[in-house]
């Protein structure tokens, strides 16, 4: 699997009314990635 993105300290930047993470880390914290093996909806990104 691809290395997880670095998301230490949640990595959130705050703007008026919105926030943004440094990266989209949802894949690394997805249900499918948690399965670790077998066929997963989020295969490693090329």
């Amino acid at each position: 699997l691809a290395d997880p993105l670095d998301h230490r300290d949640a990595g959130d930047l705050w703007f008026p009314g919105e926030s943004e993470s440094f990266e989209d880390a949802h894949v690394e914290h997805s249900i499918s990635r948690s399965l670790l093996e077998g066929e997963i909806p989020f295969p490693p990104t090329s």
């Epitope: 949640a10 943004e20 989209d24 880390a25 914290h29 997805s30 249900i31 948690s34 990104t45």
Partner: antibody, heavy 114, light 112 residues
Framework: EVQLVESGGGLVQPGGSLKLSCATS????????MHWVRQASGKGLEWIAH??????????YYAESVKGRFTISRDDSKTTIYLQMNSLKTEDTAVYYC?????WGQGTTVTVSS | DVVMTQSPLSLPVTPGEPASISCRSS???????????LYWYLQKPGQSPQLLIY???NLASGIPDRFSGSGSGTDFTLKISRVEAEDVGVYYC?????????FGPGTKVEIK
């Protein structure tokens, strides 16, 4: 087999409260980020809440439309997430889905009406 | 908020023919690591949404390769190379980079 099963929906009067549950199974739960997304009848999808993992101090985020009224939480020991909904409004009427963004539950219907 | 728009909102299709749906975001969804936080879902009638494409161009597992995603930082396209009857439903694009996360209004695909 991955399963996400929502429950707790029903009919409630405006100003009332409901607590939705989403029981999960079939995958290691503790590191997964979870969300609630809702859909009013015949309308599109609206993201409303997000909870991260223990390693992220269970950080939570909300849509402005529910901020201060809804609370997302999780119990890692029960592999369940929750949505406490207070001060409900008629516009909260919708099907509520729990999701990891890849897998989705079947939804539970909340109707707010007098 | 990041506004997601889609066109067309309704798309009559012919089985065996190609189809294309456009999505535009009001700001770039490209991150510093080259990831584009754009996702496509299909909600078939009476069902929950299902993931088709993640991070703009990655095909979700179990999804037929007739589906593909492409685009830039703000303009995205979902293509179906050969539409099948089972592809009917509402297609949504979504961004999961900036809070609040937002979905497009949906494109209803139906057989002519």
């Amino acid at each position: 087999e991955v399963q996400l099963v929502e429950s707790g929906g029903g009919l409630v009067q405006p100003g009332g409260s409901l607590k939705l549950s989403c029981a999960t199974s079939g995958f290691p739960f503790s590191n997964v980020w979870m969300h609630w997304v809702r859909q009013a009848s015949g309308k599109g999808l609206e993201w409303i809440a997000h909870i991260k993992a223990k390693s992220d101090n269970y950080a939570t985020y909300y849509a402005e439309s529910v901020k201060g009224r809804f609370t997302i939480s999780r119990d890692d020991s029960k592999t369940t997430i929750y949505l406490q909904m207070n001060s409900l409004k008629t516009e909260d009427t919708a099907v509520y889905y729990c999701t990891g963004l890849d897998y989705w539950g079947q939804g539970t219907t909340v109707t707010v009406s007098s | 908020d990041v506004v997601m728009t889609q066109s067309p909102l309704s798309l009559p299709v012919t089985p065996g023919e190609p189809a294309s749906i456009s999505c535009r975001s009001s700001r770039s969804l490209l991150t510093s690591k080259g990831i584009t936080s754009l996702y496509w879902y299909l909600q078939k009638p009476g069902q929950s949404p299902q993931l088709l494409i993640y991070r703009m161009s990655n095909l979700a597992s179990g999804i037929p390769d007739r589906f593909s995603g492409s685009g830039s930082g703000t303009d995205f396209t979902l293509k179906i190379s050969r539409v099948e009857a089972e592809d009917v439903g509402v297609y949504y694009c979504a961004q999961f980079l900036v809070y609040p996360y937002t979905f497009g209004p949906g494109t209803k695909v139906e057989i002519k």
